[in-house]
């Protein structure tokens, strides 16, 4: 069964800066990755970035830099101020559309005990939805 992992980290240098890393543990070919916050994409969440392996990357504030880390993992740096600033309990979700497995989504947030600059190791998060 494919799995999606999500890792959220607050940067030590800027407390309003977050790094989200997501990966797909499956054998299929990834066709699209959608990163959202505030809940799953299409279920109350707001899209921050869309990454297509061949068409490129699109992102919207407060996303600052989205990129592919490998063929099956991505990272996104968020910077915010005021209303658009993420907070410590913000939920971030990553949805991977792949062939032939379909769509798999998982969410994560900053570990409660995290000091800035620290984060939990990237472990598979609970699968919220498989379309």
């Amino acid at each position: 069964t494919p799995e999606v992992w999500v890792q959220v980290r607050m940067e030590a240098t800027e407390l309003s800066s977050f790094t989200i890393r997501c990966g797909f543990l499956g054998s299929g070919s990834i066709s699209l990755v959608t990163v959202s916050w505030g809940g799953p994409n299409g279920a109350g969440g707001t899209t921050l970035a869309v990454l297509h392996p061949e068409r490129g990357i699109r992102q919207w504030a407060p996303a600052r830099q989205a990129r592919w880390e490998t063929q099956s993992s991505i990272s996104l740096i968020l910077e915010g101020s005021g209303a658009s600033s993420p907070c410590a309990n913000t939920t971030f979700c990553c949805k991977f559309a792949s062939f032939p497995e379909g769509s798999w989504e998982a969410c994560g947030s900053l570990p409660p005990s995290s000091d800035p600059g620290l984060s939990a190791p990237p472990t598979p998060a609970p699968i919220l939805r498989a379309d």
């Epitope: 899209t47 297509h52 061949e54 490129g56 919207w60 990129r67 592919w68 880390e69």
Partner: antibody
Framework: QVQLQQPGAELVKPGTSVKLSCKAS?????SYWINWVKLRPGQGLEW???????????NYNEKFKNKATLTVDTSSSTAYMQLTSLASEDSALYYC???????WGAGTTVTVSS | DIVMTQSPDSLSVSLGERATINCKSS????????????LAWYQQKPGQPPKLLIY???TRESGVPDRFTGSGSGTDFTLTISSLQAEDVAVYYC?????????FGQGTKLEIK
């Protein structure tokens, strides 16, 4: 099928503003971002910006940041681009295009003339 | 901004012959993470909006005839039409799909000789 509908033409006076529309159909409007592109004869295509209807958040090409304002009305599945302080160099064909530029509207010709 | 430069500006080719359009970007369009080139090609016929032909430098959009081929990597890309047809008369644009702002080349006008 996915369609983006734009009015054919707008004739406006120098110094005024115009609000162009792009009505989407055939898909969930809030899941697909809208780009705006300018075409002037002999000058090629220029990307003005994009907006994600799900979050109402735009990105702008710096060149157009003081010229264009992108908005959406999710209730009518329509994207808008307002152009201000119009001058002769704003006379052009303006296209909306969905997502990764894979679906295009037919374009609106804006003519700035007194 | 990434500057996209196409050559030639115009091209006249006989029916059935090969047409080649080049595109050079001022910065690499290669994504190091997944080793993909983010470059697209569009065809624009008179009175019509642009039509996506090629994305990812070499992947044909669904429904595009296989006489259209995209190639290249990094900063140098090529669109080749293997056997020119009358309906291929158009202006062709390359586009940086890599980073904001999404810049286009100045266009290459393709005509029948």
């Amino acid at each position: 099928q996915v369609q983006l509908q734009q009015p054919g033409a707008e004739l406006v006076k120098p110094g005024t503003s115009v609000k162009l529309s792009c009505k989407a159909s055939g898909y969930t409007f809030t899941s697909y971002w809208i780009n705006w592109v300018k075409l002037r004869p002999g000058q090629g295509l220029e990307w003005i910006g994009d907006i994600y209807p799900g979050s109402y958040i735009p990105n702008y090409n710096e060149k157009f940041k003081n010229k264009a304002t992108l908005t959406v009305d999710t209730s009518s599945s329509t994207a808008y681009m307002q152009l201000t302080s119009l001058a002769s160099e704003d006379s052009a064909l303006y296209y909306c295009a969905g997502g990764y530029f894979d679906v295009w509207g037919a374009g609106t010709t804006v003519t700035v003339s007194s | 901004d990434i500057v996209m430069t196409q050559s030639p500006d115009s091209l006249s080719v006989s029916l059935g012959e090969r047409a080649t359009i080049n595109c050079k970007s001022s910065q690499s369009l290669l994504s190091s993470g997944n080793q993909k080139n983010y470059l697209a090609w569009y065809q624009q016929k008179p009175g019509q909006p642009p039509k996506l032909l090629i994305y990812g430098a070499s992947t044909r959009e669904s429904g595009v005839p296989d006489r259209f081929t995209g190639s290249g990597s990094g900063t140098d890309f090529t669109l080749t039409i293997s056997s020119l047809q009358a309906e291929d008369v158009a202006v062709y644009y390359c586009q940086n799909d890599h980073s904001y702002p999404y810049t286009f080349g100045q266009g290459t006008k393709l005509e029948i000789k």
